[in-house]
């Protein structure tokens, strides 16, 4: 038995996690670059 609501919910959750991870990586990179430039 499969129900789309669990896949919809989980896919949404994982997309949000991926975006958060990406933004953290980008912001972390920028911060390191700023520190390096100082």
């Amino acid at each position: 038995h499969s129900d789309g609501i669990f896949t919809d919910s989980y896919s949404r959750y994982r997309k949000q996690m991926a975006v958060k991870k990406y933004l953290a990586a980008v912001l972390g990179k920028r911060y390191k670059q700023r520190v390096k430039n100082k």
Epitope: H1, S2, F6, T7, Y10, S11, Y13, Q16, M17
Partner: antibody, heavy 108, light 113 residues
């Protein structure tokens, strides 16, 4: 997935084969275990697209997730097994579709 | 690591009665609503009942209701039937960056008299 009897310190690989949908369709395959008479315990998840993984902190490198897109399988490698790892191991697609589970018994 | 405390661990109800199962999360689940409920009968894998704290899966009777947000969640079974005798588990989704992605509650055994 093939379970069975393993001696303490031994290893075992459990594999879950996708049927009715393709592993190449990309989703998260998660693994959950349940010791006899106990509750459910999350082990980890693997994304079938990139192979990206997340593990429960207690796993501590003892278990490893992998996937084979060509064979439409997701696998869980169990290492350094102890009696405490005796459990029914379930694979699940997005916590939506669940496999029947496979019993792993660790005993000397 | 996060903790999902499920209470009670066991509950007995008469047919037609009401069962309330609580799930308390520490910290809050992600987005305050990423919590699912599962039903498990002996010898079977879990079956999804409710996603996103309150969305009922198709084919699940309307006597099952999920509610709550953040750290406090409830599964209510109104008009309990014999078929509802099972173990029930909550599952939280968390911020993977700072803690484990998931945790299950300890489970609640529902006995129907």
């Amino acid at each position: 997935a093939e379970g069975g009897l393993v001696k303490p310190g031994g290893s075992l690989e459990l594999c879950c084969k996708a049927s009715g949908f393709s592993l190449s369709s990309t989703y998260w395959m998660c693994w959950v275990r349940q010791a006899p008479g106990k509750g459910l315990e999350w082990i980890g998840c693997i994304y079938t697209g990139s192979g990206s993984t997340d593990y429960a902190s207690w796993v501590n490198g003892q278990f490893t997730l992998s996937r084979d897109i060509d064979q439409s399988t997701g696998c869980l490698q169990l290492n350094s097994l102890t009696v405490a790892d005796t459990a029914m191991y379930y694979c699940t697609k997005n916590f939506d579709l669940w496999g029947p589970g496979t019993l792993v018994t660790v005993s000397s | 690591a996060q903790v999902l405390t499920q209470t009670p661990s066991s509950v007995s109800a008469a047919v037609g009665g009401t069962v309330t199962i609580n799930c308390q999360s520490s910290p809050s689940v992600y987005s305050n609503n990423y919590l699912s409920w599962f039903q498990q009968k002996p010898g079977q894998p879990p079956k999804g009942l409710i996603a996103d704290a309150s969305t009922l899966a198709s084919g699940v009777p309307s006597r099952f209701k999920g509610s709550g947000s953040g750290t406090q969640f409830t599964l209510t079974i109104s008009g309990v039937q014999c078929d509802d005798a099972a173990a029930y588990y909550c599952l939280g989704y968390y911020d993977c960056g700072s803690t484990d992605c998931h945790a299950f509650g300890g489970g609640t055994e529902v006995v129907v008299k």
